[in-house]
Interface confidence: low
């Protein structure tokens, strides 16, 4: 006779485990008795049931209620057992002992592995800012049994880096990503991808990326210098930048106060028909969380009746 | 430190009976199958009996069916082997033996042994 | 019953290898397991475990002591003997009840 059994049954935390033990035996030999076991290193055997074939299946009382037989039909020589609702406890070495007749004693040995899989978490890393150095873009822990797999999925370019902590029945994986903020990366996906085979599919978690910048301002409206003449309606000045987070703007005249009619509508400024009055140094003061850029324009304001031509001269700052 | 320590041997007629105990220490009794395995003086070894851990189960040789019994006391850490009907080629040295933990059917631990000498 | 044939006696010099053969009758594997046991005795003691299931050493056993075979033949080779080593050797089977040892073999110094 042969006893057949699997060198690993495999099962997710929760799930019954079916522990397979099958005499395949000579034609007239029986299957006396099945002795279930725990094997544990160093510390020998815990039964865990016995199946007698008179008496039936016998559980000692730390299994009370978690071993029973599998479904009928029963095959007199198969010694399989079910454990239920297997948990991380339960992962370890069992012995199948099976005592036939006339052939003699067999037995076999199988590892169960109960799978936890993992909850995966995602942290962000600290603010990112453009013009920093290589920086924590976001961390992600998953912590299961066996270690679970942690990887990302991104277009952005950057550097990752695992660590793994073992702790007594699972072990936490932990992956970071790393990168040089820039202002391409604003609002790209940055995925953490688990994988477990206690998992049906991989997990994913994203983040979406924020940099913090502002772009160069620079101010709009003076391009053709003719049209800022006496009595022109409708002219406006528009300051541009870009930053994340959206910045805000202010307008002031260098060489004083605004001119009375000037409106400020957030980045735009606009005049009532043009006099010489609004002729000046008009400053675009942009500004985030982040930074602040300044922009400055000189607006001459012609007037028709003279022949002289316009003059007009732009400066940036910042 | 696994300690088994035999007694109960000594000189008996044939057809006499004799009961030997194995006390057992230094590792979880009610864990393992316990075994005995007799040696015939100047002659090599030979499994006479085992027992399940929890005693639900014996094994004999055929030599020995019917005539030895192999029992154990959980509360007492011990094993026996009542021998009944005993014949001169029962003489031997008996051990008494602890199976090894693992699959495969070996034998780990082994007291220091009992004479039993049948004779008349 | 499974007979195990072991040769009565080997004469060996210290320093150098010693191998042990254990034959069965009949196969003494199941699945991927090789079921023999080699046990040392010395004249007055109990038999020790020295390797199990073929080719794994007893924890405390020195390195010098290795098993190997399938099927039928299997071997326990001392390399290299020391005076300690002096003993009979006993392989053991467990594919089937009952479990039978061979006779023996005594180690001698040449």
């Known amino acids: 006779g042969e006893l057949e059994t699997s060198d690993v049954v495999t099962v997710v935390l929760g799930q019954d485990a079916k522990l397979p033990c099958f005499y395949r035996g000579d034609s007239g030999e029986q299957v006396g008795q099945v002795a279930w076991a725990r094997v544990d290193a160093g510390e020998g055997a815990q039964e865990l049931a016995l199946l007698h074939s008179k008496y039936g299946l016998h559980v000692s009382p730390a299994y009370e209620g978690r071993v029973e037989q599998p479904p009928p039909p029963r095959n007199p020589l198969d010694g399989s057992v079910l454990l239920r609702n297997a948990v991380q406890a339960d992962e370890g070495e069992y012995e199948c002992r099976v005592s036939t007749f006339p052939a003699g004693s067999f037995q076999a040995r199988l590892r169960l592995r109960v799978l936890v899989p993992p909850l995966p978490s995602l942290n962000p890393g600290p603010a990112l800012e453009e013009g920093q150095g290589l920086t924590l873009a976001a961390s992600c822990t998953a912590e299961g049994s066996p270690a679970p797999s942690v990887t990302w999925d991104t277009e952005v370019k950057g550097t990752t880096s695992s660590r793994s902590f073992k702790h007594s029945r699972s072990a936490a994986v932990t992956s970071e990503f790393h990168l040089v903020p820039s202002r391409s990366m604003n609002g790209q996906p940055l995925t953490c991808v688990v994988s477990h085979p206690g998992l049906l599919q991989d997990q994913r978690i994203t983040h979406i990326l924020h940099v913090s910048f502002l772009a160069e301002a620079s101010v709009r409206g003076l391009e053709d210098q003719n049209l800022w003449h006496i009595g022109r309606e409708g002219a406006m000045l528009k300051c541009l930048s870009e930053g994340q987070p959206p910045p805000s703007y202010n307008w002031t005249r260098l060489d004083g106060p605004l001119p009375s009619g000037v409106r400020v509508d957030g980045d735009t400024l606009g005049f009532p028909p043009l006099t010489t009055e609004h002729s000046g140094i008009y400053v675009c003061h942009v500004s985030n969380e982040f930074s602040s850029r300044d922009s400055q324009v000189t607006v001459d304001v012609l007037d028709p009746q003279e022949d002289s031509g316009k003059q007009v001269d732009l400066v940036s700052a910042s | 430190e696994v300690q088994l320590v035999e007694s109960g041997g000594g000189l008996v007629q044939p057809g006499r009976p004799l009961k030997l105990s194995c006390a057992a220490s230094?590792?979880?009794?009610?864990?393992?199958?316990m075994a005995w395995v007799r040696q015939a003086p100047t002659k090599g070894l030979e499994w006479v009996a085992a027992?399940?851990?929890?005693?639900?189960?014996?094994y004999y040789r055929d030599s020995v069916k019917g005539r030895f019994t192999v029992s154990r006391d959980k509360a007492k850490n011990s094993l026996y082997l009542q021998m009944d009907s005993l014949r001169s080629e029962d003489t031997a040295t008996y051990y008494c033996?602890?199976?090894?933990?693992?699959?495969?059917?070996?034998?780990?631990?082994w007291g220091q042994g009992v004479m039993v000498t049948v004779s008349s | 019953d499974i007979v195990l044939t072991q040769s009565p006696a080997l004469d060996v010099s210290l320093g150098q290898r010693a191998t042990i053969s254990c034959s069965a009758s009949?196969?003494?594997?199941?699945?991927?397991?090789?079921?023999i046991h080699w046990y040392q005795q010395k004249p007055g003691q109990q038999p020790k475990l020295l390797i199990w299931?073929?080719?794994i050493l007893t924890s405390g056993i020195p390195a010098r002591f290795s098993g190997r075979g399938s099927g039928t033949d299997f071997t326990l080779t001392i390399n290299p003997v020391q005076a300690d080593d002096i003993a009979t050797y006993y392989c053991?089977?467990?594919?089937?009840?009952?479990?039978?040892f061979g006779a023996g073999t005594r180690l001698e110094l040449k």
């Open positions: 033996a602890r199976q090894g933990p693992s699959y495969g059917y070996y034998f780990d631990y």
């Open positions: 230094g590792f979880s009794f009610s864990h393992y199958d």
């Open positions: 027992i399940s851990p929890s005693g639900g189960s014996t």
């Open positions: 009949q196969s003494v594997s199941i699945s991927r397991y090789n079921l």
């Open positions: 299931r073929t080719s």
């Open positions: 053991q089977q467990s594919r089937e009840s009952p479990f039978t």
